[in-house]
Interface confidence: low
C-alpha cells in the first residue's frame, strides 16, 4: 500500500508565439482545478477507460480575473497535493493524465459551469521510495509543470511496496530467512501475510493478501482439492496416482480477486468482475465514496460520505455515463450550417463560420462584396459565400495590395526558368522545349507541334510572357 | 537518452518511391511527438510531418497525399513513405523526437532528439 502524490507547480502559456487568451475575464471570472487518472502498465489507453490505479480531485484553485489587456499569466493553483492512495503493489510503470479544469463563476443557469481547459498524458517507469520527478508537458499553447513520487505507506517498503517492515525483535539479527530493511537497518523484513484464512499447507503468497494454491488444490482459500473425476479441463501435467491430467495453474486459479469478485481469464491474464461498491484490478478497493474521486472529466460527486451510501456524478455538459466517463459527440448532429466547423468547448457549442458566412450556427449569407474594396484597379468578385478579388496584372493577394511575383506560380512548364520582367514575366525554356510557357515540345525533326515559333527566335530561347 | 537512426534513402527518379526507417533506441518508454524533417542545400529545415503519441498526424503542405508517416511502437521505429516524388523534395531528411509532447500537438521548436539523417536524391 502507497501513496501516489502529484505536486502542480504552474499552468499558463508555453512559451513560443500564439500564447493563448486568458481563460477568465471580468465578465466571467473563473478558477482552475485539476484532476489526474493513473493506470497500471504503459498501455495507450483512451481517456475515457477505468482509472484502474485511481484517481484524485484537487480542490478549486483562488479565483482570478483577467486583467484587460493583459497576456495570459501562470494561473493561481489550488493549494496543497493530490494523492491517489494505492492499496496493491506499486506497478512500476503506470499512465497518467492529468486534467485542468475550468470552473466559470458568472451568473450561470443551475451553478457553476466547468469546461476543460487541458489534458495531458503520459506514461512513465517510477519506482516508489524515490525522489520527486519532474516533468512538464504541453497541451495546445498551454504548459503544465508538475512533480510527482510514489511512496508506501509503513510498514510497506521497497520500489513495489511489497516487502513489510517490523522492529527488530532481537538487537542484532533479524528472524531465520529475513534480511534487515534497507534503508531502516534497526527493522526487519516481515513475512508475507497471506489471505486471512489460506490454508498454510496447500496455498502460499508473493504479495500481501493473496492466496495461491499449490497443485491439486483450489478455491480462494486453497481448500477445496480438484477433483480427479471427470478430467473435463486437462491443462497440466499427468497425475502419477490418477493417472488423470490436473489442471496445471491457470491466471484464475485461487481467485485473485478479492470481495466477492469474480474472475474470467482473459488472453494475456485474467479480469475481475467486482460487485457493486468495489473497484480495482483485483476488486481491491472497497468503499467508493465521494473522496475517491470517482467522476471523471469534471463530473461534481454528491453524497457517498461514508462506504455505505452510493454517489452520484452530475455531469457536465458533454459528458455522460454513472461516472461521466463518457464523452457527449455532440458536433455530430452537425449543428453547423454551410460548411462551418463545429467546436464542442464542453460548456457549449461553438460553429466557426467559413468566410461570407456569420452567426451562432452560420446561418446568415454575407454579401461578400459588400464594404470590400480592392485595390490597384482589381474587381471584387462573389462566390460561394467568399469574396476575392481579381487582380490587376502585377499585384496580388487577398485585395490586390501586394505586388505580385509573377513567377510565383511556377508558370514555365517541363523545367523552364521563370524570370521576372517589368512587364510580366519571362520563361526561358528546357533544351526541347518552346512557347510563351515552355508548353510545346520540339519535335525530333527540328519541327515544332503547334504554333510555331515566332520569328527570329529559337527552340530554347527565353520567351517573354507579358 | 534516445538515439535515432535513418534509414532507406537514396536516388530516385520523379515519380518514383522511397521508405524512410527512424528506429529508435534507449529511453524509449516516454510518450513522444515523432517527426520528419528535411534540409536542402541552402534551404531553411522544414517540418515534413510528424506523429503525435494517440497516432494523429499532420503533414506539410507541399508533401500532403504523396508523403504518409506511421509508426511501429512494438519496434520502435518511425516511417516515412514517399510517393509520387519531385525534384524538390531532394534534400537530407532527419527524423527527431519531442519528449514533452502530448495533447495531440507537436512543436518543431522543440524536439530535444535528432538523427543523423539520411539523403534523398530525385533527379528529373
Known amino acids: 500500500a502507497g501513496v501516489f502524490e502529484l505536486q502542480i507547480h504552474s499552468f499558463g502559456p508555453g512559451p513560443g508565439p500564439g500564447a493563448p487568451r486568458s481563460p477568465c475575464s471580468a465578465r466571467l471570472p473563473c478558477r482552475l482545478f485539476f484532476r489526474v487518472c493513473l493506470k497500471p502498465g504503459l498501455s495507450e489507453e483512451a481517456a475515457e477507460s477505468p482509472c484502474a490505479l485511481g484517481a484524485a480531485l484537487s480542490a478549486r484553485g483562488p479565483v482570478y480575473t483577467e486583467q484587460p489587456g493583459a497576456p495570459a499569466p501562470d494561473l493561481p493553483l489550488p493549494d496543497g497535493l493530490l494523492q491517489v492512495p494505492f492499496r496493491d503493489a506499486w506497478p512500476g510503470t503506470f499512465s497518467f493524465i492529468i486534467e485542468t479544469w475550468r470552473e466559470e463563476l458568472g451568473d450561470q443557469i443551475g451553478g457553476p459551469a466547468w469546461s476543460l481547459l487541458a489534458r495531458v498524458a503520459g506514461r512513465r517507469r517510477l519506482a516508489a521510495g524515490g525522489p520527486w520527478a519532474r516533468d512538464i508537458q504541453r497541451a495546445g499553447a498551454w504548459e503544465l509543470r508538475f512533480s510527482y513520487r510514489a511512496r508506501c505507506e509503513p510498514p510497506a517498503v521497497g520500489t513495489a511496496c511489497t516487502r513489510l517492515c517490523r522492529p527488530r525483535s532481537a538487537p542484532s539479527r533479524c528472524g531465520p530467512g529475513l534480511r534487515p530493511c534497507a534503508p531502516l537497518e534497526d527493522e526487519c523484513e516481515a513475512p508475507l501475510v497471506c489471505r486471512a484464512g489460506c490454508s498454510p499447507e496447500h496455498g502460499f503468497c508473493e504479495q500481501p493478501g493473496e492466496c495461491r494454491c499449490l497443485e491439486g488444490w483450489t478455491g480462494p482459500l486453497c481448500t477445496v482439492p480438484v477433483s480427479t473425476s471427470s478430467c473435463l479441463s486437462p491443462r497440466g501435467p499427468s497425475s502419477a496416482t490418477t493417472g488423470c491430467l490436473v489442471p496445471g495453474p491457470g491466471p484464475c486459479d485461487g481467485n485473485p480477486c478479492a470481495n466477492g469478485g469474480s474472475c474470467s481469464e482473459t488472453p494475456r491474464s485474467f479480469e475481475c468482475t467486482c460487485p457493486r461498491g468495489f473497484y480495482g484490478l483485483r476488486c481491491e478497493v472497497s468503499g467508493v465514496t465521494c473522496a475517491d474521486g470517482p467522476c471523471f472529466n469534471g463530473g461534481l460527486c454528491v453524497g457517498g460520505a461514508d462506504p455505505d451510501s452510493a454517489y452520484i456524478c452530475h455531469c457536465p455538459p458533454g459528458f455522460q455515463g454513472s461516472n461521466c466517463e463518457k464523452r457527449v459527440d455532440r458536433c455530430s448532429l452537425q449543428p453547423c450550417r454551410n460548411g462551418g466547423l463545429c467546436l464542442d468547448l464542453g460548456h457549449a457549442l461553438r460553429c466557426r463560420c467559413r468566410a461570407g458566412f456569420a452567426g451562432p450556427r452560420c446561418e446568415h449569407d454575407l454579401d461578400d462584396c459588400a464594404g470590400r474594396a480592392c485595390a490597384n484597379g482589381g474587381t471584387c468578385v462573389e462566390g460561394g459565400g467568399a469574396h476575392r478579388c481579381s487582380c490587376a496584372l502585377g499585384f496580388g493577394g487577398r485585395d490586390c495590395r501586394e505586388r505580385a511575383d509573377p513567377c510565383a506560380a511556377r508558370p514555365c512548364a517541363h523545367g523552364g526558368r521563370c524570370y521576372a520582367h517589368f512587364s510580366g514575366l519571362v520563361c526561358a525554356c528546357a533544351p526541347g522545349y518552346m512557347g510563351a510557357r515552355c508548353e510545346f515540345p520540339v519535335h525530333p525533326d527540328g519541327a515544332s507541334a503547334l504554333p510555331a515559333a515566332p520569328p527570329g527566335l529559337r527552340p530554347g530561347d527565353p520567351q517573354r510572357y507579358l | 537518452q534516445v538515439q535515432l537512426v535513418e534509414s532507406g534513402g537514396g536516388s530516385v527518379q520523379a515519380g518514383g518511391s522511397l521508405r524512410l526507417s527512424c528506429t529508435a533506441s534507449?529511453?524509449?518508454?516516454?510518450?513522444?511527438?515523432m517527426g520528419w524533417f528535411r534540409k536542402a542545400p541552402g534551404k531553411e529545415r522544414e517540418g515534413v510531418a510528424d506523429?503525435?503519441?494517440?497516432?494523429?498526424?499532420s503533414y506539410a503542405d507541399s508533401v500532403k497525399g504523396r508523403f504518409t508517416i506511421s509508426k511501429d511502437n512494438a519496434k520502435n521505429t518511425l516511417y516515412l513513405q514517399m510517393n509520387s516524388l519531385k525534384p524538390e523534395d531532394t534534400a537530407m531528411y532527419y527524423c527527431?523526437?519531442?519528449?514533452?509532447?502530448?495533447?495531440?500537438?507537436?512543436?518543431?521548436?522543440?524536439?530535444?532528439?535528432w538523427g543523423q539523417g539520411t539523403q534523398v536524391t530525385v533527379s528529373s
Open positions: 506523429i503525435v503519441s494517440d497516432g494523429s498526424t
Open positions: 534507449g529511453d524509449t518508454y516516454r510518450s513522444y511527438c
Open positions: 527527431a523526437v519531442d519528449r514533452g509532447g502530448s495533447g495531440g500537438y507537436c512543436y518543431t521548436g522543440r524536439y530535444d532528439y
